[in-house]
Interface confidence: low
């Protein structure tokens, strides 16, 4: 009696179970009563990442430099190419089909985590005692100058965007 279901890594066709092609290979012809499934390796620019009955391999992803993309990992017959973004850019999505510039942290904020090819800059507000007066994708919040260690006194308090202003101690006592 013809099977109604097949084992793992097999598929049902013409009332019989044929072996699937292994990853990295595509189907050329189904098995028959007398012959095995015929499979062929994918070409250099193609891949298939599962046991399959595909008659065409998938093209490797193209990391398009005009969209700021570059190859992070070259594809094989069993894996797709992995793209990442060029210096100064990061992916807009997990599949990394396009890139956008890293954002800068505005004055009053410092860099908590520098951007990578796949993630944007993470900024954090400068806490009391720290400041940032620049828009930067690299600089952390900096501590206020310690006037005391320079034998000076605070003439103007610092903010999250400005350093303290130090001045000479009042000599008149």
């Amino acid at each position: 009696e013809p099977p109604t279901a097949c084992r793992e890594k097999q598929y049902l066709i013409n009332s019989q179970c044929c072996s699937l092609c292994q990853p990295g290979q595509k189907l050329v012809s189904d098995c028959t009563e007398f012959t095995e499934t015929e499979c062929l390796p994918c070409s250099e620019s193609e891949f298939l990442d599962t046991w399959n009955r595909e008659t065409r391999c998938h093209q490797h992803k193209y990391c398009d430099p005009n969209l700021g993309l570059q190859v992070q990992q070259k594809g094989t017959s069993e894996t797709d190419t992995i793209c990442t973004c060029e210096e100064g850019l990061h992916c807009t999505s997990e599949s990394c089909e396009s890139c956008v510039p890293h954002r800068s942290c505005l004055p009053g904020f410092g860099v908590k985590q520098i951007a990578t090819g796949v993630s944007d800059t993470i900024c954090e507000p400068c806490p009391v005692g720290f400041f940032s007066n620049v828009s930067s994708a690299f600089e952390k919040c900096r501590p206020w100058t310690s006037c005391e260690t320079k034998d000076l006194v605070v003439q103007q308090a610092g903010t999250n965007k400005t350093d303290v202003v130090c001045g000479p101690q009042d000599r008149q006592r």
């Epitope: 398009d64 005009n66 999505s93 956008v100």
Partner: antibody
Framework: EVQLQESGPGLVKPSQTLSLTCTVS????????WNWIRKFPGKKLEYMGF???????YYTPSLKSRITISRDTSKNQFSLKLSSVTAADTAVYFC????????????WGQGTLVTVSS | DIQMTQSPSAMSASVGDRVTITCRAS??????LSWIQQKPGGTIKRLIN???TLASGVPSRFSGSRSGTEFTLTISSLQPEDFADYYC?????????FGGGTKLEIK
């Protein structure tokens, strides 16, 4: 100035292949990204895909099995083929240029109406 | 895919009025949004790119702004030639997606 001009049959029978060509002047199809977009009766616009300066293509997932975008650099044209069409593919088809993110889609063709009917 | 929710879908206004159309993106699109205009004749014209940059040759009464994932097109003083359909387009992530459109009619 950059100009794009769509051309092709205005009437296609169901199950047949819709074929359109976009002729580009004032720029080369060997630079930038050349896109197809369609507008259905009513207001809905749908992005279909592109062919890039290098010849690589991107197709919107819902059309992947039916769409082919190609180019002819000698004629400075790029083309759209959409197979197995139905009445739901009746739309105005636009070609458009995209070069830089800062500029977005900066030039559009005037559009051509394709009706799918027997 | 990124969904673009545009409102209103239709509105009527008078010459000289200030008009605002908004689009909200379902995900972060990093400012990569265009506003386009389609006249009754069918031709499409880019008005704004990168959320707030006025395209060359477009009158200064058109402006675009962004607040997070919400984008706004403003026409400061409507002119007779501005009555048309308007769409937002996100081009941050493939497939690019459009808002549902706003039909701007004469009151």
């Amino acid at each position: 100035e950059v100009q794009l001009q769509e051309s092709g049959p205005g009437l296609v029978k169901p199950s047949q292949t819709l074929s359109l060509t976009c002729t580009v002047s004032g720029d080369s199809v060997s630079s930038g990204y050349w896109n197809w977009i369609r507008k259905f009766p009513g207001k809905k616009l749908e992005y279909m895909g592109f062919i890039s300066y290098s010849g690589s293509t991107y197709y919107t997932p819902s059309l992947k099995s039916r769409i082919t975008i190609s180019r002819d650099t000698s004629k400075n044209q790029f083309s759209l083929k959409l197979s197995s069409v139905t009445a739901a593919d009746t739309a105005v088809y636009f070609c458009a240029r995209f070069r830089r993110y800062d500029d977005g889609v900066d030039y559009w063709g005037q559009g051509t109406l394709v009706t799918v009917s027997s | 895919d990124i969904q673009m929710t545009q409102s209103p879908s239709a509105m009527s206004a008078s010459v000289g009025d200030r008009v605002t159309i908004t689009c909200r993106a379902s995900h972060e699109i990093s400012g990569y949004l265009s506003w386009i205009q389609q006249k009754p004749g069918g031709t499409i014209k880019r008005l704004i790119n990168a959320a707030s940059t006025l395209a060359s040759g477009v009158p200064s009464r058109f402006s675009g702004s962004r607040s997070g994932t919400e984008f706004t097109l403003t026409i400061s003083s409507l002119q007779p030639e501005d009555f048309a359909d308007y769409y937002c387009l996100q081009y941050s992530s493939y497939p690019w997606t459009f808002g549902g459109g706003t039909k701007l009619e004469i009151k």
